[in-house]
């Protein structure tokens, strides 16, 4: 009776279990009753990083110098190239597809540490009593205005993104 499931590193085709190609190799032809799976190594600047039945290898990532990228680790037949940014620049994501001088902290967050050549901007949420209503790469969270010191009262509470709104005290008649 033909199998309905195969072992690890195998795949089911034409009611038959065939071996997958190992990382670094692509599928040329499926196995038959009489022959093994035929695999071929990936070419230069290509890779496959899993046991597979792919008929085409993936192209290594290109670290585009026009985007500030350079090769951190050269790809092999089993691994993709890893890009990083030129010195002093920072990757915009884990995949490092583009570079920025530094990132800004969004409203509601303040700058805890300004970027350096080795570390990007470190942001922190504005705690109660502080706010930031701007996107900035250098501004800290600002304290809410103290209405009391201006002989005013709070008319609208502050948030992490907005200052308090002060207004005149109600005078007793």
């Amino acid at each position: 009776e033909p199998p309905t499931a195969c072992r690890e590193k195998q795949y089911l085709i034409n009611s038959q279990c065939c071996s997958l190609c190992q990382p670094g190799q692509k599928l040329v032809s499926d196995c038959t009753e009489f022959t093994e799976t035929e695999c071929l190594p990936c070419g230069e600047s290509e890779f496959l990083d899993t046991w597979n039945r792919e008929t085409h290898c993936h192209q290594h990532k290109y670290c585009d110098p026009n985007l500030g990228l350079r090769v951190q680790q050269k790809g092999t037949s089993e691994t993709d190239t890893i890009c990083t940014c030129e010195e002093g620049w920072h990757c915009t994501s884990e995949a490092c597809e583009s570079c920025v001088l530094h990132r800004s902290c969004s409203p509601g967050f303040g700058v805890k540490q300004i970027a350096t050549g080795v570390s990007d901007t470190i942001c922190e949420p504005c705690p109660v009593g502080f706010f930031s209503n701007v996107s900035s790469a250098f501004e800290k969270c600002h304290p809410w205005t103290s209405c009391e010191t201006k002989d005013l009262v709070v008319q609208q509470a502050g948030t992490n993104k907005t200052d308090v709104v002060c207004g005149p005290q109600d005078r007793l008649r």
Epitope: L67, E86, V100, H102, S104, E139
Partner: nanobody, 116 residues
Framework: EVQLLESGGGLVQPGGSLRLSCAAS???????EMWWVRQAPGKGLERVS?????????YYADSVKGRFTISRDNSKNTLYLQMNSLRAEDTSVYHC?????????WGPGTLVTVSS
Amino acid sequence: EVQLLESGGGLVQPGGSLRLSCAASGFTFRDYEMWWVRQAPGKGLERVSAINPQGTRTYYADSVKGRFTISRDNSKNTLYLQMNSLRAEDTSVYHCAKPPFIFGDWGPGTLVTVSS
């Protein structure tokens, strides 16, 4: 298209002064925080100074505090850096930059050489 063009660099003796300008176009200048960044020959980038959109808040690297002053004229779409008491270690190419600070999204820079 965003364009930033720095000018005002040159050769100056230690202790001297220079005023750099950065002419901005292709974006609403008054809406953006702006930065001056410098790169000395064979060295990494140094973030020198920054100013908020309204020109009311500023940042200075410790290495330039008390000597450099950043300012802006939103009516002229221009950023400035007044540099006093210049030292040999201030020799660099100075660039202005705007958010989101994407690589290559800045001008060619202006070279400041401090030497006797």
